[in-house]
Each structure stands twice: as structure tokens, then as C-alpha cells.
């Protein structure tokens, strides 16, 4: 089967190959070819291109933000690893460490607090925070965490929040707060991740990371 | 239905501090999809940014105001308020206050109060 | 500072379309947009995101964007859109509003 199909493949080619040979002999004006016929093999050739360029116009329109296919939409993702931090902020740390990822320099990791992306398009973002609290030792808030942006020229936002109580348990219980959504980003954006109290999360292997994907 | 209201005093001394809260009922001021701004207008003029508040607390200011002007938020009001100290006449104007809509690609203000005279005279 | 330049005043006849300019350096890499304010009344968003229009707002009232220029055309101008028109944009965490512009429906 497979040769009957690489021979298939072969007289296609061949065919392309002629087609294509008379259409440069036609725009020499090669006397062996009729008017009628170079007229016939120009329109079709003509048909051809304009399909392929409509194609092409109606593919962009669909996906306005989309790069085209191959080496021009390269793979861009990111998978950052959490850091202790000294700072009394809110805005958590980040390090390329352990199991990390970042898959080239459409996405960087800024400041170890947030990921720029260079590219626009549809991003999904998501964190995991694990944190450590007690009822009694916290304030009667609950623990929030925050997914935010901050495009070039517009106001920093939140896209994402999620809250969980404090455990009873002592000296300190154990919870994980995930938070993961698809958001359009333009070129500059940037994104990190809040919570209410820095202090309280879980720095060990695996419990608190941050990353993104461009679909 | 999104209503905002403002409030306080409609004439000021010059040198004082020009105090205004804007009420917001039929929505929570603490939605993070929205900001809350102030837009000021003097008699006869165009529209002037003032500033922005987030319901996380998060503030931005008209550069040429940024010196002396502060917008706060209470929550527990659904409220937002805006002082301006050291007053001039030159801040006589109409104040308005304003909900920022957030949207993916462009910001806008989508719902306005009608807007208090605040005059500065002695 | 950023700066947003229009027309101080426009006039049209009723039926007859109508366009306001709205002009600032790289415009047309920002997203405008326009506000009505009728005299005495609060000021009410009629085209955003360049060309989108919010819901309650009449077909008639469009917005375009090119090069350094927006521009708000309202065709089959009414009476009723006789006010003031404002374009606004962002730059660097800014929020700026062009001077206005009074049109006049004779």
C-alpha cells in the first residue's frame, strides 16, 4: 500500500512539475503554445492563488491574535517554582529552580515577582498557593489569594480570587488554594500572584507554584 | 440598577481641603472587575481626570494632581471618597464621580453621578 | 503630558451625518473613546474600544480610528444629539480627554 502510495505521490508531483513549466513557457510566449491554451492554464493558475490567498485572509479573521502555524507560533510556556522571601509584601516570590519551566524569551520572570509575556494571544494562567494558618492565631479574615495583570498603560487588576478559611489545627493546618483561567493578553502584560498574608505560605517542594501556557 | 451619588459640601474656603464621598448602590464597590473614579469639570471647561480607585486600595492620579489629591475606599459603606487639600479657585468645578468598567482589551466609564458643584470662594 | 486635540465646534443639519475628529500622537496605537454630555446632564459613553457601541446606544453613532485620528460620525443627526462630545484615551496609566466638541444640530 504504501508504494502504490509514494508512486501516487510521485505522478501528483510530476504533474505540479509540467503544470507549473508551462505557465513559464506561456510568460516567455513560447511559440509551441497556443494563445487559447495559456489563457486557460493563467486563469486556472489565477483561481488557484486567489483561493489560496482567501484561505489565508479568512484564517486571520478567525484568529485575529494567532500567529501563523511553524516556527512563528513557537511553544510559550512558563512553570515557576515559589521562593521565600524577607519582604514583607504581598506579592509572592518566584525562582527558576527544581522542576521549573520557561520556554524561551517570549516569557520571562521578572523581578521574581511576575510573568511578562511578549506575545499577545490566549493565555491559561493558573497558581497554587499552599498555606498554613491557624484560627486562633489569624485574624478573623480569611486567606485570599489573587491572580493579577498589569498591561502596559492600563491599570492593574485582578482576574482571579480565592479564599479559604483557617484551620483549627495546631500548630498550623494545611490548605491548597488553586486558581486557573484563560485570559487574552497583549504584548507587555504581566501577571503575579497576591495573598493576605505572605507569612503563612508553603514554601516545600510541590506546594506553591505559578505558570502559564499560550494556547 | 447602578447608581452612584456624591456628597459634601458645595462651597469651600481657599486653602482648605475639598472633601466629597460618593455613595454607589446596585453594585458592590468591592467587585474587582470595576474601578471607581473622579472626573471634575470647571464651569463652562472640559472633562478633567482626577483619579482611580480599586477596591484592593490600589490608587491612580492625574499627574498634574497626583501632590495633593487622595481617593480612599470603605467597603463596609460601599463607598469611595476623594479629599483635595490647599484648595484654589482654580478648583471650582462640577465633581463627578464614576465607575470604571474593565474590560479585556480597553477600559471605559460606564456609569457616571450627576456631578455636585463644588465652588472655592471665601 | 499626553494631549487629545478636537474641534471646539461642529454643526450639521438634521438628517445630514456628521463627524468629530479626535487627534493625539500614536491614536491610532490606543483605544478611544467618545462621551455625550447634554447640557446640564452627566456625561454618557457612546462609542468605546474605537468602534463598539453600548448597548442602548443608536445605530447612527459609530467610531473609527486611523493613524493619529479617531473620529465619531453620527449619520441622520438628530435634534436630540445636539451636546457636547468628548473623546478620551489612555497613556501610561492616564486617563486624558480631548478639549470637547459643541455640536450644533441648525
Known amino acids: 500500500h504504501r508504494r502504490l502510495d509514494k508512486i501516487e505521490d510521485e505522478r501528483n508531483l510530476h504533474e505540479d512539475f509540467v503544470f507549473m513549466k508551462t505557465i513559464q513557457r506561456c510568460n516567455t510566449g513560447e511559440r509551441s503554445l497556443s494563445l487559447l491554451n495559456c489563457e486557460e492554464i493563467k486563469s486556472q493558475f489565477e483561481g488557484f492563488v486567489k483561493d489560496i490567498m482567501l484561505n489565508k485572509e479568512e484564517t486571520k479573521k478567525e484568529n485575529s491574535f494567532e500567529m501563523q502555524k511553524g516556527d512563528q507560533n513557537p511553544q510559550i510556556a512558563a512553570h515557576v517554582i515559589s521562593e521565600a522571601s524577607s519582604k514583607t509584601t504581598s506579592v509572592l516570590q518566584w525562582a527558576e529552580k527544581g522542576y521549573y519551566t520557561m520556554s524561551n524569551n517570549l516569557v520571562t520572570l521578572e523581578n521574581g515577582k511576575q510573568l511578562t509575556v511578549k506575545r499577545q494571544g490566549l493565555y491559561y494562567i493558573y497558581a497554587q498557593v499552599t498555606f498554613c494558618s491557624n484560627r486562633e492565631a489569624s485574624s478573623q479574615a480569611p486567606f485570599i489569594a489573587s491572580l493579577c495583570l498589569k498591561s502596559p498603560g492600563r491599570f492593574e487588576r485582578i482576574l482571579l480570587r480565592a479564599a479559604n478559611t483557617h484551620s483549627s489545627a495546631k500548630p498550623c493546618g494545611q490548605q491548597s488554594i488553586h486558581l486557573g483561567g484563560v485570559f487574552e493578553l497583549q504584548p507587555g502584560a504581566s501577571v503575579f500572584v497576591n495573598v493576605t498574608d505572605p507569612s503563612q505560605v508553603s514554601h516545600g517542594t510541590g506546594f506553591t507554584s505559578f505558570g502559564l501556557l499560550k494556547l | 440598577q447602578v447608581q452612584l451619588q456624591e456628597s459634601g459640601p458645595g462651597l469651600v474656603k481657599p486653602s482648605e481641603t475639598l472633601s466629597l464621598t460618593c455613595t454607589v448602590s446596585?453594585?458592590?464597590?468591592?467587585?474587582?472587575?470595576?474601578?471607581w473614579g473622579w472626573i471634575r469639570q470647571p464651569p463652562g471647561k472640559g472633562l478633567d481626570w482626577v483619579g482611580c480607585?480599586?477596591?484592593?486600595?490600589?490608587?491612580y492620579y492625574n499627574p498634574s494632581l497626583k501632590s495633593r489629591v487622595t481617593i480612599s475606599v470603605d467597603t463596609s459603606k460601599n463607598q469611595f471618597s476623594l479629599k483635595l487639600p490647599s484648595v484654589t479657585a482654580a478648583d471650582t468645578a462640577v465633581y463627578y464621580c464614576?465607575?470604571?468598567?474593565?474590560?479585556?482589551?480597553?477600559?471605559?466609564?460606564?456609569?457616571w453621578g450627576q456631578g455636585t458643584l463644588v465652588t472655592v470662594s471665601s | 503630558s499626553y494631549e487629545l486635540t478636537q474641534p471646539p465646534s461642529v454643526s450639521v443639519s438634521p438628517g445630514q451625518t456628521v463627524s468629530i475628529t479626535c487627534s493625539g500622537d500614536?491614536?491610532?496605537?490606543?483605544?478611544a473613546c467618545w462621551y455625550q454630555q447634554k447640557p446640564g446632564q452627566s456625561p454618557v459613553v457612546v462609542i468605546y474600544?474605537?468602534?463598539k457601541r453600548p448597548s442602548g446606544i443608536p445605530e447612527r453613532f459609530s467610531g473609527s480610528t486611523s493613524g493619529n485620528t479617531a473620529t465619531l460620525t453620527i449619520s441622520g443627526t438628530q435634534a436630540m444629539d445636539e451636546a457636547d462630545y468628548y473623546c478620551?484615551?489612555?497613556?501610561?496609566?492616564?486617563?486624558?480627554f480631548g478639549g470637547g466638541t459643541k455640536l450644533t444640530v441648525l
Open positions: 446596585g453594585d458592590s464597590i468591592s467587585s474587582f472587575i470595576y474601578y
Open positions: 480607585i480599586y477596591s484592593s486600595g490600589g490608587t
Open positions: 474600544q474605537d468602534d
Open positions: 500614536k491614536l491610532g496605537d490606543k483605544f
Open positions: 478620551q484615551a489612555w497613556d501610561s496609566n492616564t486617563v486624558v
Open positions: 464614576a465607575r470604571l468598567w474593565l474590560g479585556t482589551t480597553t477600559d471605559y466609564f460606564d456609569y
